[in-house]
């Protein structure tokens, strides 16, 4: 008998998955920027806001050159999972003041989930370790006040914006190494 019949190609490969992840990240970055601007218009921020439960920014411009594929994808996935939990929390516990932004927050959550699925597919195809997040999941209690939920929203959108910004740069750099 001759060689066995081959398999038809599936819809994408790791390089295409990485391209797709870059496009999704850029699109999510634009959404986040727009939503953060809406927040500032509706609820002007008095300075920078932070939230202890948010992940610390993983990369700086100086460390971009030394990025390795496994580290970037693992860290990005863990951080985005944290932001997804925070967006879900905002939608659930944000109170009446944030209800006006519900459609935008819902769309943001859906895009975040889609990007996470694409990153996971990429990591599976490359057979990179997909460890569960190391840090224990901090339970997110209800905001102390209406202003507390607005401050939290500013912090979440600001942090997500910075994370996605380095993610785009990091993923573009990694494209040259795959």
């Amino acid at each position: 008998p001759g060689p066995p019949a081959g398999s038809p190609r599936v819809s994408s490969d790791p390089r295409a998955d990485l391209d797709s992840a870059v496009l999704l990240t850029r699109s999510l970055l634009a959404d986040t920027r727009q939503l953060a601007a809406q927040m500032r218009d509706k609820f002007p921020a008095d300075g920078d806001h932070s939230l202890d439960s948010l992940p610390t920014l993983a990369m700086s411009a100086g460390t971009l050159g030394s990025l390795q594929l496994p580290g970037v994808l693992t860290r990005l996935r863990v951080d985005l999972m944290s932001y997804l939990r925070h967006v879900q929390w905002l939608r659930r516990a944000g109170g009446p003041s944030l209800k006006t932004l519900e459609p935008e927050l819902g769309a943001l959550q859906a895009r975040l989930e889609r990007l996470l699925r694409r990153l996971q597919l990429l990591m599976s195809r490359l057979a990179l370790p997909q460890a569960a997040p190391d840090q224990p999941v901090i339970p997110l209690g209800p905001p102390a006040s209406a202003w507390g939920s607005i401050r939290a929203a500013h912090a979440i959108l600001g942090g997500l914006h910075l994370t996605l910004d380095w993610a785009v740069r990091g993923l573009l750099l990694l494209k040259t190494r795959l």
Partner: antibody, heavy 114, light 111 residues
């Protein structure tokens, strides 16, 4: 068209060794993580081992840890599985698979028996 | 004993719709890890049928669809045909293994 062609299977005595190979073509082998998955006669699929696209990560099922070694040669588009201290319960069809796994070979039968 | 639980068998008549379930836990399916489905026709190698919960590879008919909710997933086959008679396996990443884990498989019989 993607092809994965396993070879190296056969009959071996308990305690013996065997080396399986998997020749890949039709896709960018060096961009894919590669797996070995086995299927005992009449049973389900059991994941055996995985190696990352560049060979830097290797993981094994508990049942083969310390006995089997997965490796790859990206310049030859070939995946390997070195199997030592073989046991009767290792008898199975061994499939090489790429990616999720997205692609599977036709398998090679390994029989461990005295 | 598989980490992912599937019914050992399922059946249906031609044209019917059948669903095969795959139950996991909070450490695999329930932890943002995607589910993939494989079809293994008698005497052949497995073939990827659904990836990332609901995506179909090119060449897979749209009669096959996948979904995931919480810690479980399901594969639906509509317009059942005799050639769909096969074993179906679900798989998901298991972080404790650093590899995929397979369900025990479901033998689908077309009556």
């Amino acid at each position: 068209e993607v092809q994965l062609l396993e070879s190296g299977g056969g009959l071996v005595q308990p305690g013996g060794s065997l080396r399986l190979s998997c020749a890949a073509s039709g896709f960018t082998f060096s961009s894919y993580g590669m797996h070995w998955v086995r299927q005992a006669p009449g049973k389900g699929l059991e994941w055996v081992a995985v190696i990352s696209y560049d060979g830097s990560y290797k993981y094994y099922a508990d049942s083969v840890k310390g006995r089997f070694t997965i490796s790859r040669d990206n310049s030859k588009n070939t995946l390997y599985l070195q199997m030592n201290s073989l046991r009767a319960e290792d008898t199975a069809v061994y499939y090489c698979a790429a990616g999720v796994p997205d692609y599977w070979g036709q398998g090679t039968l390994v029989t461990v028996s005295s | 004993q598989s980490v992912l639980t599937q019914p050992p068998s399922a059946s249906g008549t031609p044209g019917q719709r059948v669903t095969i379930s795959c139950s996991g836990s909070s450490s695999n399916i329930g932890s943002y890890y995607d589910v993939h489905w494989y079809q293994q026709l008698p005497g052949t190698a497995p073939k990827l049928l659904i990836y990332s919960n609901e995506e179909r590879p090119s060449g897979v008919p749209d009669r096959f669809s996948g979904s995931k909710s919480g810690t479980s997933a399901s594969l639906a086959i509509s317009g059942l045909r005799s050639e769909d008679e096969a074993d179906y396996y679900c798989a998901a990443w298991d972080p404790s293994l650093y590899g995929p884990v397979f369900g025990g498989g479901t033998k689908l019989t077309v009556l």
